[in-house]
Structure formats: structure tokens, C-alpha cells
């Protein structure tokens, strides 16, 4: 490798390895090495090796080291944000009210104008306004997947309050997915969650949104608060460019 | 600031500035500023100013960007694990066998053996071997709390496998308060998400260490692989040495 | 990504992730850790190119901004961007200990 | 952590965070980022000694490693840890855009 | 301050024993081996053998099994060696010394005097 | 068991002097190495762990280095309060086992 001055690569595989035994014995806290004076003959133990081996290995559900930063995601996102269809829409009249759910919906085809293409979304959130909410509530979002079928998404404790304050749930993926199909209207579903045993399943949170009766000025705001997704995504040009450009150096 | 050579720290904060004219421009890849001659007069629009700021706003549940690592967690961590009380133990007895759930308790004596004090404990495991699994399993995960009350910690989408598969569930704050408290035995009960709706809640999925009729070698094996709490600890000694040692340079 | 998967299989002058593989025995004299007998450290190597001023053809910087100089440093260093923990065997005295370093294992570099 | 807390109430001579205020008219000449008017981008600067030879006083060593070269690199390098995004709003013609530029300000420095 | 104090000078008779004890402050008793050393005169330091005081756990050199025994009391932090049918060539200062892991002996005792002569 | 071989067995020096004594064990003791200051009526006292480590409170005038099976103890300049008998040990296997000593003396 040569910069104005040639890197001897040896010397500086000798400075690493000779730094790797000075943070190997400080990370271990160690001023020098444990002498092996007193370790017993023979294999290590087998819990230990059990305990290694499970230290080890990845296990599903259990999270990585953060990935590295995708090229992509280097350059600026633009941000969008689509509301939900309002709740006066007919889509709404085909899901029954419940105590325990309630149904948001969106626009695909503003969704669309917004990323034209799925590659491009680089995030997507869904924010809800919650109203005060007097008991802790568990509650799970669902995104609408067949004619009268839910696939459960995530799920958020939230905690009593005096105050509104916004909710935010990752559905990049579902959002990418719809981007690919032809639908018109997509949806999600705010539910309590229910326990196998427990039968008072009634959703306690108050969305702005979903409340009625209101009049004038009032509901305006109320409905600009209403859900939306805020979109991420690399403009459709920059994307075009980032194509073009994309090599090997 | 002084090395070897005086560092201009003015010329420093001008390099830095001029990259940071490149860096903004390179990020929206842009060539050169726009043009400002098309932008319509006054005050930016409402609509704008609201996206800016539910941008700009951080919300509950949104993940910021990754926390620096505290100092105590650049040293090592001391693995140990501690294994499930075994099924025949009385414990099992007062709770009911049901379709949608399976206990799992743990002896706190030799947690506290492992993790001498809460504030130690640097992450805690619940690891599940799970046997193979004909169809998509939704599971949840529940602390138990009080004498017949249980507390939801998280859920987790299992997808049909033919092989057995380890799962892990991060329970560090649920051992961290173990540690704190003086119950001799605590546990978690593995369920069936329950959809308000439906009414097939059975628990599919097959946990090494819960089913019956195995015997000799088979039966040890299987112990060996009974669900377990994997814990990652600062040893007392450590801690001590950090504590004393602890100052602003 | 410079990760392993692209610099190792390249002949990339600027700043890249490096091949290095640590065997405890041989190339640090210690005998005490148990398992693993060693394990690839690598370590990040190579010029970062301090690429923007008024006067630079802006044209040829922004293709480039991103590599050389992505968080608009004075003076952008090749370090470790995706790091992994290493789990280690050890004996203190008479006892086995098993521990779990953190950010040992470089994976992939940046310029920072 | 060597964060805007510790570095901005301190006289820290090595690898730290440095205060450094953009703002887009003044510093940069640009009347074309309506929000926001300018932002706390601040730098990482000053010494990461190399702290490790077998002849080293390995006392002093030890509290050191962690600030100094905690990731073990050859030549450390105070570079970023941890960095905010930044949304700006600027018009494209008669367009107004809100755009999220990730890491641009810098909340924390390291030694790597 | 880390300290072991010794216990005071002893003349002995050969075929007699010796005990000798050593009283640790300063630290926690039980979370470092204490060993036992011995220097006869004009000649070097030979080691004898040591104690966990955790576990109780105890390791004799070859030339002093049988003879030797280690003992602790972990109430006081004490630690003890005794020496049985002793001969004139034991004639020598016993030290008890700290272990510590890294492969070396931190913190001694002053060290007492076991002479013995008919 | 290992053996350590040190050397010289005693040395003439003044207040000053850069002084030097050697260690040599049977096998490779794999860097645990250690030496160690004994005066009349005194505790010992450890200097040096790990063949270079110095311990705490201990001034930088004392050194050490090697490897494998060769170790060596230097003082760059004598103080008067140096004079005394060094000793070696390998921690690496057991028995621990120390070198002879060397008695440094004033000339």
C-alpha cells in the first residue's frame, strides 16, 4: 500500500498485535497474564465448553452487533408523511366496531406518489397521537393481510399519562410490501392485547382520530393529528444517479 | 491543543467547515446550491413546517441512534449459566398444566451465586431449545409477578423448522430485579399469543425439557438442554476495581 | 461496505479492512487462554483522501464524498466501523472462567 | 464518555468533542436551507497516545487503554462515536423539500 | 494497607513441632491463596506449599508432604503452618506470602525465625 | 521441577552504577517471571511481575525484560538504599521455584 509514504504493512501487523495483548488484558482487567501454574491436566471441563459454545453461537431472536451503514443509506432520505384516510371513508364500514381495536387506512396511490418505487423507502414509521391515558395499557398493531386476516406486526406497553404524545411503530416492511402490490387501500389495526386467560380485552388508549362530536377549528387540528406514516426514501433522481455511479473501487 | 506539532485549532474548525459544506451538498447530491429564485415569498408553508418537526422531534418507541457503550461495559463480562429447576421439582405443581402455556422456574440462590449484586449484571438470557415445529407459531413471554399474576415481557414469530433450534429472550432487567428481591424461586411462563378473536390458542411448539417418557442417556442429554438463563456479569472483584479507579482524566 | 466479503478479495489502496489472523500461542507467547486458540482480529488500513474545498471539481468529489470523507471530518482516519465479540476460555488459579470481549473482531472500516 | 458534558466543561487536552457551531448564512455563504437557520455540528479532536509496549508501566496502562485504544488499532485516531441526524428544509424551484441527513452532528468522540 | 504479620521466633527441639501463624488486614482474607516459603540460612527461598482460604483447598510441595500442614481460620484471618518431627536442617525463617494469579507473591510476611537444636 | 540459575551470585558496585543480573530457568517459563528485594530484618518485597511489569511504588530505575528462558533484572543507577539480595521466581508451573539470589554489596 503506498500513501505519500509506503505503509510498511509488517510493522503495522506488529503494532496491532502487540496492541490486541495490551486490550485483551485490560478489557479482562489483568495486569499481566493468570499464570497456569495450578489448571488442572486434561480437557476443559465440559460445562465450560457447553458455556462457551453457547456464549458462542448466534441463537435466533437474539440481536446482532449494529450492521454496518448500507452505501445507500449514506445519502439524504426526503421525508414525507401520508395521513390516514379519514375515518368517515366507507372502508371503514366493513370492520366492525370493537372495544378492542381500532382501524387505520391508507392510500396506496399516495403512498406511491410519495415512493414510486419499494427499493427506494429506506423507512417508515407509523405515528399515532395518544390522548391521556389513565391505566397501562398493552396494546399490538396488526397490518390487514387478506379479505378478513391480520398478521400481527409488534406490540408497545405504554405507560398511564397526563399528556398526548406520539406513538411510533418501524413498518418499513410492510410499507415496502404494499409499494409492491396493487392495492388501493392498506391498513393496519391498533388492538389490546389479549391474554389466553384474561376476558377484559378492551382497548383503554385514546387515539386522536377516533374520537367524534368534534366541530369547526377543532377538528381541523384533530384531523391533521390524525395517523400517518412518515416516509424515508431516497428521491427517485438520486436513486437513478446513485445506479449510474454504483462501482467497485 | 499540543502534540508533537501545535494543532491550529482555527484551521481545524475551517477544514471541518468546508467539509461540511461538501457533505451536505454530496448527501443530496447535489452538484451546487439551488437556485433560491422560484421560492415563493413569506414564511414557509404550515404542511412543511409540521413535516419538519415531527421530523426533527424524537417520539416514544422510536429507537434513537445507538447509544455510546458506557465504560463499564468495555471490560469483560464473566459468562455463567444457571439451569431451569428440573419439572419433577414441587414448584411445577401449583401451576396448571394448560394447552397454551409451559413454566419455567429458577432457583434465585444460585443466580445470586453467579451475580453476587443486581447492578453487576450486564445482560441476562433466557435460552429455549425449541424441537423441530410442523406450523408458524406466535409465543409470548411472561414474568411471573405475584401469586397468580403474570407480567408480558415480549413475543416472538417462530417459523416451521425441521431442525431443533435455540431461541433466546433478553431478560436482563427481569433478573436484574430477581437479584433485588428476596424470592427463593421465580419464573417465566412461555404462551400462545392469543388473538382476541381466535379461539385456537394451543402452544405447538415443542421446548426441550418438557416432554415426558425419556430415559438414561436420552434423559441427561436432555436435561443437559433444558431451558437456562445465559447471564453476562462484571465479578465482584472487577467491579471493585473499577469503582476505586473510577475518575475524570 | 469496506468489509471483509469486498477487501479481502481486492487490491484496494484506500482504506480497507485487512487480513489478520491472532494465534494466541505464536504470536503473543501466551499459553493461558484456553479456547479459542486464536481468531481473526484483522484491523483497518489505508489513505482516507481529505477530498473537498472550494476549488475541488465538485463533479468528481461527490462520487467519492461518500468514502473518503462521509462525516466531513478535518481530517478523515480509517477505523473499524462493524465490530464482534470474542468469547474466551481462561483459567484464574484453580478456575475456569468464561468471558465475552467486546468489539474484538473487525469486520468492515470507514472513513471517520 | 467523551461526550459534549464532559468535553465542553473541560480543558481535555486529548481526543475529545469540540464545540463548533455552523451557522449556513455566515459560515457557509448559503441562503438556501430555510430550517434550520444553522446547527451544533462540532468536531473530534486531540491526541489518542498509543499506549501499549511490552516495556510499558503497565499499571498506568490499564486505567488508560479503555480512553486511549480501546479498539487495539496500530495508529488510534479520535474519530465520531456517537452522531445525530439532522432534517433541513430547502426548496427545489418552487418545491419544498424536508430531507433527513443522517450523521452530521457529532454527540460523542472515541479513540479507534 | 495490605499486611501479614508474623508470629514471633521459636527454638525448638529435633522430633518437635512448630506452628507458626500469620494474620492478614487490609484485604479480604479469602480471595487470595496465602503460600508458605522458607530460607534457611545463607541459601535461597524455597516454596512449601499453599491454602485457599475459600475452599480450603491446600497443595504441598513433594519435600514436605506428611510433614506439613496448612491450616486457616477465616473468623480471624489467620493463616498457620505447622511442622512436625523437625530436624535441624528446618532450621530456617518461614515466611507466609499473598499469592496472586498473575504468577507472583504481592505482599509477605516479615517472616519468623524456627530454630532447632538439641 | 524447574530449576533457576542466577547470576552472579554476588556484585561489587558504587552508587550510579548501571547494574545487571541474569536468570536462567531449565524450560520456558513463558514470561512469569519475577524478582524479587530482600534486606536484613525486612518483609521481601516484589519489584518486577511478568518479567517487566513494574509493581506499584516501585521507581522506574528498576527494569526488567526477556523471554523463553532468559531474564534479566537491570538497575540504571544505584541508589544507596539498592543494596541488598535480588531474587528470581517462575510462576509459570509448579513448585514455584526461585533462583540463589544475588547480593548486591557496596564497593
Known amino acids: 500500500l503506498s500513501t505519500c509514504k509506503t505503509i510498511d504493512m509488517e510493522l503495522v501487523k506488529r503494532k496491532r498485535i502487540e496492541a490486541i495483548r495490551g486490550q485483551i488484558l485490560s478489557k479482562l482487567r489483568l495486569a499481566s497474564p493468570p499464570s497456569q501454574g495450578e489448571v488442572p491436566p486434561g480437557p476443559l471441563p465440559e460445562a465450560v465448553l457447553a458455556l462457551y459454545n453457547s456464549t458462542r453461537d448466534r441463537v435466533a431472536g437474539e440481536s446482532a452487533e449494529p450492521e454496518p451503514e448500507p452505501e445507500a443509506d449514506y445519502y439524504a432520505k426526503e421525508v414525507t408523511r401520508v395521513l390516514m384516510v379519514e375515518t368517515h371513508n366507507e372502508i371503514y364500514d366493513k370492520f366492525k366496531q370493537s372495544t378492542h381495536s381500532i382501524y387505520m387506512f391508507f392510500n396506496t396511490s399516495e403512498l406511491r406518489e410519495a415512493v414510486p418505487e419499494p427499493v427506494l423507502l429506506s423507512r417508515a414509521e407509523l405515528r399515532l397521537l395518544r390522548l391521556k391515558l389513565k391505566v397501562e395499557q398493552h396494546v399490538e398493531l396488526y397490518q390487514k393481510y387478506s379479505n378478513n386476516s391480520w398478521r400481527y406486526l409488534s406490540n408497545r406497553l405504554l405507560a398511564p399519562s397526563d399528556s398526548p404524545e406520539w406513538l411510533s411503530f418501524d413498518v418499513t416492511g410492510v410499507v415496502r410490501q404494499w409499494l409492491s402490490r396493487g392495492g388501493e387501500i392498506e391498513g393496519f389495526r391498533l388492538s389490546a392485547h389479549c391474554s389466553c386467560d384474561s376476558r377484559d380485552n378492551t382497548l383503554q388508549v385514546d387515539i386522536n382520530g377516533f374520537t367524534t362530536g368534534r366541530r369547526g377549528d377543532l377538528a381541523t387540528i384533530h384531523g391533521m393529528n390524525r395517523p400517518f406514516l412518515l416516509l424515508m426514501a431516497t428521491p427517485l433522481e438520486r436513486a437513478q444517479h446513485l445506479q449510474s455511479s454504483r462501482h467497485r473501487r | 491543543l499540543s502534540t508533537c506539532k501545535t494543532i491550529d485549532m482555527e484551521l481545524v474548525k475551517r477544514k471541518r467547515i468546508e467539509a461540511i459544506r461538501g457533505q451536505i451538498l454530496s448527501k443530496l447530491r447535489l452538484a451546487s446550491p439551488p437556485s433560491q429564485g422560484e421560492v415563493p415569498p413569506g414564511p414557509l408553508p404550515e404542511a412543511v413546517l409540521a413535516l419538519y418537526n415531527s421530523t426533527r422531534d424524537r417520539v416514544a418507541g422510536e429507537s434513537a441512534e445507538p447509544e455510546p457503550e458506557p465504560e463499564a461495559d468495555y471490560y469483560a463480562k464473566e459468562v455463567t449459566r444457571v439451569l431451569m429447576v428440573e419439572t419433577h421439582n414441587e414448584i411445577y405443581d401449583k401451576f396448571k398444566q394448560s394447552t397454551h402455556s409451559i413454566y419455567m422456574f429458577f432457583n434465585t440462590s444460585e443466580l445470586r451465586e453467579a451475580v453476587p449484586e443486581p447492578v453487576l449484571l450486564s445482560r441476562a438470557e433466557l435460552r429455549l431449545l425449541r424441537l423441530k415445529l410442523k406450523v408458524e407459531q406466535h409465543v409470548e413471554l411472561y414474568q411471573k409477578y405475584s401469586n397468580n399474576s403474570w407480567r408480558y415481557l415480549s413475543n416472538r414469530l417462530l417459523a416451521p423448522s425441521d431442525s431443533p433450534e435455540w431461541l433466546s429472550f433478553d431478560v436482563t432487567g427481569v433478573v436484574r430485579q430477581w437479584l433485588s428481591r428476596g424470592g427463593e424461586i421465580e419464573g417465566f411462563r412461555l404462551s400462545a399469543h392469543c388473538s382476541c378473536d381466535s379461539r385456537d390458542n394451543t402452544l405447538q411448539v415443542d421446548i426441550n425439557g418438557f416432554t415426558t417418557g425419556r430415559r438414561g442417556d436420552l434423559a441427561t442429554i436432555h436435561g443437559m438442554n433444558r431451558p437456562f438463563l445465559l447471564l453476562m456479569a462484571t465479578p465482584l472483584e472487577r467491579a471493585q476495581h473499577l469503582q476505586s479507579s473510577r475518575h475524570r482524566r | 461496505a469496506l468489509d471483509t466479503n469486498y477487501c479481502f478479495s481486492s487490491t484496494e489502496k484506500n482504506c480497507c479492512v485487512r487480513q489478520l489472523y491472532i494465534d494466541f500461542r505464536k504470536d503473543l507467547g501466551w499459553k493461558w487462554i484456553h479456547e479459542p486458540k486464536g481468531y481473526h482480529a484483522n484491523f483497518c488500513l489505508g489513505p482516507c483522501p481529505y477530498i473537498w474545498s472550494l476549488d475541488t471539481q465538485y463533479s468528481k468529489v461527490l462520487a467519492l464524498y461518500n468514502q473518503h470523507n462521509p462525516g466531513a471530518s478535518a481530517a478523515p482516519c480509517c477505523v473499524p466501523q462493524a465490530l464482534e465479540p470474542l468469547p474466551i476460555v481462561y483459567y484464574v488459579g484453580r478456575k475456569p472462567k468464561v468471558e465475552q470481549l467486546s468489539n474484538m473482531i473487525v469486520r468492515s472500516c470507514k472513513c471517520s | 464518555a467523551l461526550d459534549t458534558n464532559y468535553c465542553f466543561s473541560s480543558t481535555e487536552k486529548n481526543c475529545c468533542v469540540r464545540q463548533l457551531y455552523i451557522d449556513f448564512r455566515k459560515d457557509l455563504g448559503w441562503k438556501w436551507i430555510h430550517e434550520p437557520k444553522g446547527y451544533h455540528a462540532n468536531f473530534c479532536l486531540g491526541p489518542c497516545p498509543y499506549i501499549w509496549s511490552l516495556d510499558t508501566q503497565y499499571s498506568k496502562v490499564l486505567a488508560l487503554y479503555n480512553q486511549h485504544n480501546p479498539g487495539a488499532s496500530a495508529a488510534p485516531c479520535c474519530v465520531p462515536q456517537a452522531l445525530e441526524p439532522l432534517p433541513i428544509v430547502y426548496y427545489v424551484g418552487r418545491k419544498p423539500k424536508v430531507e433527513q441527513l443522517s450523521n452530521m452532528i457529532v454527540r460523542s468522540c472515541k479513540c479507534s | 494497607e495490605v499486611q501479614l504479620v508474623q508470629s514471633g521466633a521459636e527454638v525448638k527441639k529435633p522430633g518437635a513441632s512448630v506452628k507458626v501463624s500469620c494474620k492478614a488486614s487490609?484485604?479480604?482474607?479469602?480471595?487470595?491463596?496465602m503460600h508458605w516459603v522458607r530460607q534457611a540460612p545463607g541459601q535461597g527461598l524455597e516454596w512449601m506449599g499453599r491454602?485457599?482460604?475459600?475452599?480450603?483447598?491446600?497443595k504441598y510441595a513433594q519435600k514436605f508432604q506428611g510433614r506439613a500442614t496448612l491450616t486457616v481460620d477465616t473468623s480471624t484471618s489467620t493463616a498457620y503452618m505447622e511442622l512436625s518431627r523437625l530436624r535441624s536442617d528446618d532450621t530456617a525463617v518461614y515466611y507466609c506470602?499473598?499469592?496472586?494469579?498473575?504468577?507472583?507473591?504481592?505482599?509477605w510476611g516479615q517472616g519468623t525465625l524456627v530454630t532447632v537444636s538439641s | 521441577d524447574i530449576q533457576m540459575t542466577q547470576s552472579p551470585s554476588s556484585l561489587s558496585a558504587s552508587v550510579g552504577d548501571r547494574v545487571t543480573i541474569t536468570c536462567r530457568a531449565s524450560q520456558d517459563i513463558y514470561n512469569y517471571l519475577n524478582w524479587y528485594q530482600q534486606k536484613p530484618g525486612k518483609a521481601v518485597k516484589l519489584l518486577i511481575y511478568y518479567t517487566s511489569r513494574l509493581e506499584t511504588g516501585v521507581p522506574s530505575r528498576f527494569s526488567g525484560s526477556g523471554s523463553g528462558t532468559d531474564y534479566t533484572l537491570t538497575i540504571s543507577s544505584l541508589q544507596p538504599e539498592d543494596f541488598a539480595t535480588y531474587f528470581c521466581?517462575?510462576?509459570?508451573?509448579?513448585?514455584?521455584?526461585f533462583g540463589q539470589g544475588t547480593k548486591l554489596e557496596i564497593k
Open positions: 487490609g484485604y479480604t482474607f479469602t480471595s487470595y491463596d
Open positions: 521466581q517462575q510462576g509459570d508451573t509448579l513448585p514455584w521455584t
Open positions: 491454602i485457599d482460604p475459600q475452599s480450603g483447598g491446600i
Open positions: 506470602a499473598r499469592w496472586d494469579y498473575g504468577g507472583y507473591f504481592d505482599v
